[in-house]
């Protein structure tokens, strides 16, 4: 419904708004103030998103997908502001929104291109598959398709397998790398160019340690300064691999400065933790403690994995008794 008086047609201008999945956004639109304001927001020029005229909303013909998700800035309309507050955007909301505003003297159309991105925090995992060792960088939900790059000892690797499953709203991506027999350090970067978000996973293999039964072992875990920021919330987990699966020995949450220890022979030095050093001690070693020990430092922006291989050998006493 637009007034039938003589009016000026103002050509369209366009802007881009980037939203994140499930967040609230504003689609901006302005016009030269005037009386008898009529506002129609449409999606892809066909679905009715929001209508306002005669001083109030008229949502009877609003497309059901927008129900209870849109509102105008009502006290700003008289100042030429027809922006739409849009709640809880989904990937299905991506596209072109057109705002038609009519007043007693003119009709204007503004186009807003809404792009929606998703970037659930990725993870870097270490897995044993039979005799092979794999590093896997994965992200459960991401959109648009991310850029994944691998480096070995800071040199880019061209081999980059990507296992991708798509759903209605986003991609789930796994990028495995076979690192069997390698002592190199590895780095995986996942970048969402739309949201300008980057996550990095870094893997470091430490030299193997040979220890005697009933001795203790100190395993280092110090974050690389390039990624680590002590102001950022992060979690540190120490785990031990036994027959292909990891069991958690202890973890630390920076937000609460809480340490949870599941193995009585495990110890953490509180003073070192305060200096962002998460090295640990395992006391009174026995033969079954042989294996791989993994330190995982994770935040929203990175995962730092450090792996130690520990070989526990029988002490001379035990050997002579046998």
């Amino acid at each position: 419904i637009f007034p039938l008086a003589f009016f000026i047609y103002v050509p369209m201008n366009e802007q881009i708004v980037i939203g994140r999945l499930d967040e609230d956004i504003i689609l901006p639109s302005s016009f030269e103030r005037g009386s008898e304001v009529v506002i129609h927001w449409k999606y892809q020029d066909s679905y009715k998103v929001h209508s306002y005229y005669k001083g109030s909303d008229h949502l009877e013909s609003q497309d059901p997908r927008y129900a209870n998700r849109t509102s105008l800035f009502y006290n700003e309309i008289q100042n030429g502001n027809a922006s739409l507050f849009f709640r809880r955007v989904s990937l299905l909301d991506e596209g072109i929104y057109t705002c038609y505003v009519g007043t007693a003297i003119q009709v204007i159309t503004n186009k807003v291109v809404l792009k929606v991105g998703v970037f659930l925090t990725p993870v870097m995992k270490y897995e044993k598959r039979n005799t092979n060792s794999f590093l896997i960088c994965s992200v459960l939900s991401v959109y648009p398709r991310p850029i994944i790059t691998w480096k070995m000892d800071n040199t880019p690797i061209s081999e980059n397998n990507m296992e991708e499953t798509g759903s209605l709203d986003s991609f789930s991506i796994n990028s495995p790398l076979n690192i069997t027999g390698s002592n190199s350090s590895y780095e995986c970067t996942i970048e969402n160019s739309l949201l300008k978000q980057t996550w990095t996973g870094r893997w470091t293999m430490k030299d193997g340690l040979h220890k005697m039964q009933s001795e203790h072992v100190s395993l280092s875990c110090q974050p690389v300064n390039d990624y680590f920021s002590p102001n950022q919330d992060f979690k540190v987990t120490w785990s031990r691999m036994k027959s292909g699966t990891f069991s958690v020995l202890a973890y630390y949450l920076s937000s609460s400065q809480n340490t949870i220890i599941n193995e009585s022979r495990f110890s953490w030095n509180k003073e070192l933790i305060n200096q962002s050093d998460f090295s640990m001690n395992l006391m009174d070693l026995n033969l079954s403690d042989s294996g791989e020990y993994l330190c995982n430092i994770s935040s929203d922006e990175y995962t730092l994995l450090t792996i130690h291989t520990v070989h526990v050998e029988p002490s001379q006493e035990t050997a002579s008794h046998n």
Epitope: I18, D22, E23, P28, S30, N68, N75, R88
Partner: antibody
């Protein structure tokens, strides 16, 4: 970590002006609408202003419209609130907030006292 | 303007108890309601948005419910650190408005 750090509060006489700043880090500032919310000495919260991600559109409640101006510098990751014609009822703690999932990140606040 | 009313200014509870903080909107706001927690000396933090969705990192003892005009924030087992002011807020229609707050006190 997302950090919002407000500054610029102080003691101002009625009718005076003051400009608050909020330095933002840890998020893609230019992608988000940003807001100011204030808390009165009686602990009531009140939405004060919002600015669109690009900075071209601003929104205010009637209580501050025409007196307060919200602006942003996306190159400097900084949000501003210019407050003019201040009144005693503007005395409050002013918080800079991100508009994402409701007001989902808040700064530590800066205090404005309007008194003669 | 939509008025958000938190009828209890204060609520007293014991550690381990279940407590429900209520909020009433002066008109239908669908599920466009958020809940905030403000601990002494700190800024508010969002706990719940869209009436029932928990914000990242919020313990699962906090639950939001309701739609239309009546909303509830429930803490299933109150902890000492839950001593705080709790606010509801609607973003259904501008101006966005907050409730007056409910102060949770631990006996």
């Amino acid at each position: 970590e997302v950090m919002l750090v407000e500054s610029g509060g102080g003691l101002v006489k009625p009718g005076g002006s003051l400009k608050l700043s909020c330095a933002v880090s840890g998020l893609t500032f230019s992608s988000y609408a940003m807001s100011w919310v204030r808390q009165t000495p009686e602990k009531r919260l009140e939405w004060v202003a919002t600015i669109s991600s690009g900075g071209s559109h601003t929104y205010y409640p009637d209580s501050v419209k025409g007196r307060f101006i919200i602006s942003r510098d996306n190159a400097k990751n900084t949000l501003y609130l210019q407050m003019n014609s201040l009144r005693s009822e503007d005395t409050a703690m002013y918080y800079c907030t991100r508009l994402g999932r409701a007001f989902d990140y808040w700064g530590q606040g800066t205090t404005l006292t309007v008194s003669s | 303007d939509i008025v958000m009313t938190q009828s209890h200014k204060f609520m007293s509870t014991s550690v381990g108890d279940r407590v429900s903080i209520t909020c009433k909107a002066s008109q239908d706001v669908s599920t466009a309601v958020a809940w905030y927690q403000q601990k002494p000396g700190q800024s508010p933090k969002v706990l719940i948005y869209w009436a029932s969705t928990r914000h990242t990192g919020v313990p699962d003892r906090f639950t939001g419910s309701g739609s239309g005009t009546d909303f509830t924030l429930t803490i299933s087992s109150v902890q000492a650190e839950d001593l705080a002011l709790y606010y509801c807020q609607q973003d259904y229609s501008t101006p966005w408005t907050f409730g007056g707050g409910t102060k949770l006190e631990i006996k």
